[in-house]
Every structure is written in C-alpha cells, then in structure tokens.
Interface confidence: medium
C-alpha cells in the first residue's frame, strides 16, 4: 500500500514538473511574441515617419548603407534601453556582420572613445543561447566574450572593437537601429 | 526651459567629505533617472553615479563605490552626492544631468571639486 501511494506521489510530482515546464516555454513563446510585436510596430512607425521626411537618417543619427544609428548620450540599464530605442521607432543595434561591427567600432571611437553601449544581444535564460532582438542567433564571429559571472540575466554591449557581456541591470550607453529612408527617384 | 544649478563644490583635504546638491527648475524631475559624472583635467567626461526616478535603484562607478552615495528628494526637485573618504584623483569639476533619451544636452554648468593631499 505505501508502495503504491509513493508511485502516486512520484507520478504526480513528474506531471507537476512537466506542466512546469509548459509553462516556462509559453512564457518564454510569450516574451517572443511580444517582442517581435513591438518590434514590427517599431519598424512600421519608422516607416511612416520617414515618409514625410527627405532625408535617409533623422538628425543626429548616423548612416551606414541601409542602416541609421544614433549613440545614445545616456545611460541606461538595458530594458530601458530597448524602450528608449522603441518610442524613437528603432531598435537597439543588432550587428549582421563583421562590417557593420568595424563601422560601429569606427564611429565609437570617433564620436566618444571607449565606453561601454548596450545592444540588442541577451541570453536566453534556460538555453543559454545568445539571442538579438529580433529572435535570431548572432553568427559564430559575433559572439559575445564570455565576461560576466552574473547570475542575473545578462545582455551584451559594445567596448572597443569588442563584443563583450554584462548583468543587463548595469547602466551604460546604447546604440539604437532603423532602416534608413530610401530616397524615392 | 530646463535649468540645473549646482552647489556644494569646493577644496577640501583627503579624507575629507563634501556633498554636492542639484537643484532642477523648468521641469519635475521626478518622472527621469539623473546622474552625476565628472571631467578631471586632461580627461573625458566619466560616469559617477546615477539614481532612478523612484530612488530606488542606484549604480556606481567602480572608483568611487563605498564612498560616495548619489540620493534625491523629488519634492524638492533635487539630486544629491555626498562624497566621502575623498582623494586628490577625485577633483574634477562635477556635473549633473536628466537622463532624458530625448533631450541629452540637460547638463548643468559643473562645480569644481579640488582634493589636496
């Protein structure tokens, strides 16, 4: 009898531990959607704000092929940094390629030497896999140097010519994205 | 418009403490983080610390952790930094800003901290 009662438990406590994990993964699938709305609605506000505008970037942000960037002068701990980059219809940087990221570094070092920018790269809680915004995975080269010993969640942010990460809670400056305006001929 | 004026600036010997007081007019403070950072002769402008508009939350440059403390009382309007066990690498003129995404250029004129050994 007691036999049968602890096969009941350990039956229920597996169940509990699977519904469990459904739940981290609607969660997780949650988080995503949510994202890749605000995302688009991001991308669309971009859209339509550039319409009524002649230029490819608005001022103060600067462009490079498709792209415009504008470099924050704040600091900000990285959500708020994803939001700052939100209202202004873009999204913080996500690096595409070796390029891009020798442009950035470029600028950096131009505009204000070697600070700390947050982009739009964190790690994914449970896999551990890195991430940008957008849900894709960054190419082999554009990986973050495994820095931060934080157990809390940790983001990824530009120093140098370097990927580099950190706890998302620090503040530092960030580096926001969007389409630059294709001149209409 | 907008208009942060500083106090509390001044010599003093290491060791020693001061604490600096950032008053904003033109615009409740309450709703933007604020930040002190510094300019030493010669150098860039470098992160000091930064407070949350609640309070709440507070961040720290590793050089002056321990011994500084940024706070603010928002119905004055103001941002503090009090600064204590100070060293001679700590005089710089020290400004303060609304950590505003839309309007970046909220600094204020600066106040010079000088340290003696």
């Known amino acids: 009898k007691l036999l049968q009662v602890s096969t009941i438990a350990m039956q229920q406590q597996e169940k509990l531990i699977q519904q469990e994990r459904a739940l981290l993964n609607f969660t997780e699938w949650k988080r995503s959607c949510a994202l890749q709305m605000k995302y688009c609605q991001a991308f669309m506000q971009n859209s339509l704000s550039s319409a009524h505008n002649s230029s490819p970037c608005p001022n103060n942000w600067i462009q490079n092929r498709e792209s415009c960037y504008y470099v924050s002068e704040i600091w900000s701990i990285w959500h708020t940094s994803q939001e700052n980059c939100l209202k202004e219809g873009s999204t913080l940087l996500q690096i595409e390629s070796k390029e891009e990221m020798d442009f950035i570094t470029g600028s950096l070092r131009k505009i204000k030497g070697s600070y700390d920018y947050w982009v739009g790269l964190s790690q994914d809680g449970h896999s551990g896999r890195w991430l940008w915004q957008d849900g894709s995975s960054p190419s082999p080269g554009l990986l973050p140097a495994e820095r931060s010993q934080s157990a809390n969640q940790v983001c990824g942010y530009v120093k140098s010519n370097s990927l580099l990460s950190s706890n998302c809670s620090t503040w530092k400056y960030f580096i926001c994205e969007k389409y630059a305006l294709r001149s209409s001929v | 418009d907008v208009q942060l004026v500083e106090s509390g600036g001044g010599s003093v010997q290491a060791g020693g403490s001061l604490r600096l007081s950032c008053a904003a007019s033109g615009r409740t403070i309450s709703n933007y983080d604020m930040a002190w950072s510094r300019q030493a002769p010669g150098k860039e402008r470098e992160f000091v610390a930064r407070?949350?508009?609640?309070?709440?939350?507070?961040d720290y440059a590793d050089s002056v952790k321990g011994r500084f403390t940024i706070s603010r009382d928002n119905a004055k309007n103001t941002v503090y930094l009090q600064m204590n066990s100070l060293k001679p690498e700590d005089t710089a003129i020290y400004y303060c800003q609304i950590q505003d995404f839309r309007s970046p250029d909220f600094w204020s004129q600066g106040t010079q901290v000088t340290v003696s050994s």
């Open positions: 407070i949350s508009g609640s309070g709440d939350r507070t």
